[in-house]
């Protein structure tokens, strides 16, 4: 392992849809992938009128944009459907919404997922 | 192991549409990237866009604002793409590859697009 | 973003060393180290041999190594051997934020 990096070797896993695609509902997602590439965490959400709909988490491949990030953040200006991938284990189980806004200050929402 | 399976070849009159399909397995469909890239007879390749899997987020490359749609059907591991307003200079062979990397290719599509 | 630029074609005789560059932009092959190495044989799908300027991909030889200084990306294959002769691609990262582009492509021939 690199100094300073953290290393993904398993990811909270959520399936909202799970029974239509015969998974598990939730649990603990062990990552796989090549030795020498990087593995990350990811969580997809919706916002139905405010009220956050958790779609799916899990494991990611290689990925640059989700490089050294600890923490995961969607930073697309209003996504259909909220992607955020982070590194490090289970650091997808929280994850928050900082748009990057061209003229304005980046506001906050902090999403903290309830447990299904 | 990896494989991304890809729909048959394709004869289209210009101006008809296309839909091509990339079936993966081996692998969690939903934990990467699907690139499409296009190879024109005797030409270099040509990226066209990507759809990240899991959001169905996509980005596509300028030339093909307007004319291109990818999407995917998480519950079939498949990828699409499907390019409209088809002219001759869109005849080659498609493929998809796998994540950022491109780690893992389709075998391509032959779409020739001719009157 | 537009594409990177390759020599057409570069040869060289079996055992021989030869390198491959692919020049860019200090926005795009200069600030990260996200380029890529295809090789292309005839008839066939392209194939990743180096990823992120210097990673030999899983399974490739040893004999392929990549590097870069400033703008420009290089594909070193060593003791060329007569399977090598193939087109050769450099390209970049896409997905999320970052747009796919690739270079014109070299075809390498081996003597």
């Known amino acids: 392992a690199i100094l300073g990096r953290s290393e993904t070797q398993e990811c909270l896993f959520f399936n909202a849809n799970w029974e239509k695609d015969r998974t598990n509902q939730t649990g603990v997602e062990p990552c796989y992938g090549d030795k020498d590439k990087r593995r990350h965490c990811f969580a997809t959400w919706k916002n139905i009128s405010g009220s956050i709909e958790i779609v799916k988490q899990g494991c990611w491949l290689d990925d640059i944009n989700c490089y050294d990030r600890t923490d995961c953040v969607e930073k697309k200006d209003s996504p259909e459907v909220y992607f955020c991938c982070c590194e490090g284990n289970m650091c997808n189980e929280k994850f928050s919404y900082f748009p990057e806004m061209e003229v304005t200050q980046p506001t906050s929402n902090p999403v903290t997922p309830k447990p299904p | 192991q990896v494989q991304l399976v890809q729909s048959g070849a394709e004869v289209k009159k210009p101006g008809a549409s296309v839909k091509v399909s990339c079936k993966a397995s081996?692998?969690?469909?939903?934990?990467?990237?699907i690139n499409w890239v296009r190879q024109a007879p005797g030409q270099g390749l040509e990226w066209m866009g990507t759809i990240n899997a899991v959001s169905g987020s996509t980005s596509y490359a300028q030339k093909f604002q307007g004319r291109v749609t990818m999407t995917r059907d998480e519950s079939i591991s498949t990828a699409y793409m499907e390019l409209s307003r088809l002219r001759s200079d869109d005849t080659a062979v498609y493929y998809c590859a796998r994540g950022g990397w491109f780690d893992y290719w389709g075998q391509g599509t032959l779409v020739t697009v001719s009157s | 973003q537009s594409a990177l630029t390759q020599p057409a074609s570069v040869s060289g005789s079996p055992g021989q060393s030869i390198t491959i560059s692919c020049t860019g932009t200090s926005s795009d092959v200069g600030s990260y180290n996200y380029v890529n190495w295809y090789q292309q044989h005839p008839g066939k799908a392209p194939k990743l041999m180096i990823y992120?300027?210097?990673k030999r991909e899983s399974g490739v030889s040893n004999r392929f190594s990549g590097s870069k200084s400033g703008n420009t990306a290089s594909l070193t294959i060593s003791g060329l051997q007569a399977e090598d002769e193939a087109d050769y691609y450099c390209g970049t990262f896409a997905g999320g934020k970052y747009y796919g582009v690739f270079g014109g492509g070299t075809k390498l021939t081996v003597l």
């Open positions: 992120g300027v210097s």
């Open positions: 081996g692998y969690t469909f939903t934990s990467s990237y």
